[in-house]
Interface confidence: low
Amino acid sequence: QLPPGKPEIFKCRSPNKETFTCWWRPGTDGGLPTNYSLTYHREGETLMHECPDYITGGPNSCHFGKQYTSMWRTYIMMVNATNQMGSSFSDELYVDVTYIVQPDPPLELAVEVKQPEDRKPYLWIKWSPPTLIDLKTGWFTLLYEIRLKPEKAAEWEIHFAGQQTEFKILSLHPGQKYLVQVRCKPDHGYWSAWSPATFIQIPSDFTMND
């Protein structure tokens, strides 16, 4: 029977800069029941606070709701593991909410083959930002990436769309069924998961771009 091993805070993420969650990995339990607590203070403050919500984020997590989340303050946090034989502490982690945003995937992905009479045909893709991202506040510059591939192909073709919420692709294989997905990231954060795939059948008379 031993004191617990050193825990590690391994990830913090925010869907929208209004709330965030941090997760830790327990160390060894020393063969005894072990309690974990996360404490934090804001940079420039000495007052320590305990995690406000151990439930929302699931096991070994701390969730910071709106009232505990400040955009321009750095949080300094650590996890304490305690059993009957003693305690151990994680390293301190410095968290700035601005840099841990991982949005939900974009919404309403729509894909259409356009075949104008006077120009090359193309694939037109459009989508909406995730609704949790409040673009009216100016907090976010969202960047988008599209991937697509023929249904049976192994490799994805990647296109960076910048801040646009629509995109045109000219070079496609006629007669193929394509999968299309889109994801987004804020300028300083993490890529979202890919949106659910949308399928589109490219007509056999689709002319490849020269």
């Epitope: 209004e18 709106k66 909406s128 409040d134 009216k136």
Partner: antibody
Framework: EVQLVESGGGLAQPGGSLRLSCVAS????????MSWVRQAPGKGLDWVGN????????NYVDSVRGRFTISRDNAKNSLFLQMNSLRAEDTGVYYC?????????WGQGTLVTVSS | DIQMTQSPSSLSASVGDSVTITCRAS??????LDWFQQKPGKAPKSLIY???ILQGGVPSRFSGSGYGTDFTLTISSLQPEDFATYYC?????????FGPGTKVDIK
């Protein structure tokens, strides 16, 4: 319940100044951008500008840039609009508003009249 | 600046009618659009954000749709308390801009 209460409106001379205040309650003021919107008598709504949570960034409509200044005091849950070089066309009701994720909340407004 | 236009500028309708108001943006604004209701002497009230998402507490007879440049607000069965002026607003780029409003009054 979200509440926003504006004050400081009144009569000002052309070229004069006024300072509007807005006191917020019912939400974490320091977490949100805040906006000012105005409405001339019998007319539609015009966005004036907004300010970031920590006061480090402001945006303005061209017609007020250089004359109006938006500021805030998070310790007092207060938003301000300093209006200088006032013109007749600045007359109207001035609303402060929060830009919350799920829509906006507005105060009841304060009337500014610019007239000689 | 992005210009917002609304049509009609006013309309007369009866209780129980279905009413549709159109808002058009001068350039693509994706779904960065709000709808507001304003009654005389009162502050505007947020009805819909992100073009189609109903604000909490707003009756389900209100609905919004559209993407890009063309948007609509529909009131499926007009109630006495719905007689008011309705504004759209884009928040895609600064400065945020409102439509000129549509006044809905009693026929």
């Amino acid at each position: 319940e979200v509440q926003l209460v504006e004050s400081g409106g009144g009569l000002a001379q052309p070229g004069g100044s006024l300072r509007l205040s807005c006191v917020a309650s019912g939400f974490t003021f320091s977490t949100y951008w805040m906006s000012w919107v105005r409405q001339a008598p019998g007319k539609g709504l015009d966005w004036v500008g907004n300010i970031k949570q920590d006061g480090s960034e402001q945006n303005y409509v061209d017609s007020v840039r250089g004359r109006f200044t938006i500021s805030r005091d998070n310790a007092k849950n207060s938003l301000f609009l300093q209006m200088n070089s006032l013109r007749a066309e600045d007359t109207g009701v001035y609303y402060c508003a929060t830009l919350l994720t799920k829509g906006d909340y507005w105060g009841q407004g304060t009337l500014v009249t610019v007239s000689s | 600046d992005i210009q917002m236009t609304q049509s009609p500028s006013s309309l007369s309708a009866s209780v129980g009618d279905s009413v549709t108001i159109t808002c058009r943006a001068s350039q693509d604004i994706s779904n960065y659009l709000d709808w507001f209701q304003q009654k005389p002497g009162k502050a505007p009230k947020s009805l819909i954000y992100a073009a189609s998402i109903l604000q909490g507490g707003v009756p389900s007879r209100f609905s919004g749709s559209g993407y890009g440049t063309d948007f609509t607000l529909t009131i499926s069965s007009l109630q006495p308390e719905d007689f008011a002026t309705y504004y759209c607003r884009q928040y895609k780029t600064y400065p945020f801009t409102f439509g000129p409003g549509t006044k809905v009054d009693i026929k």
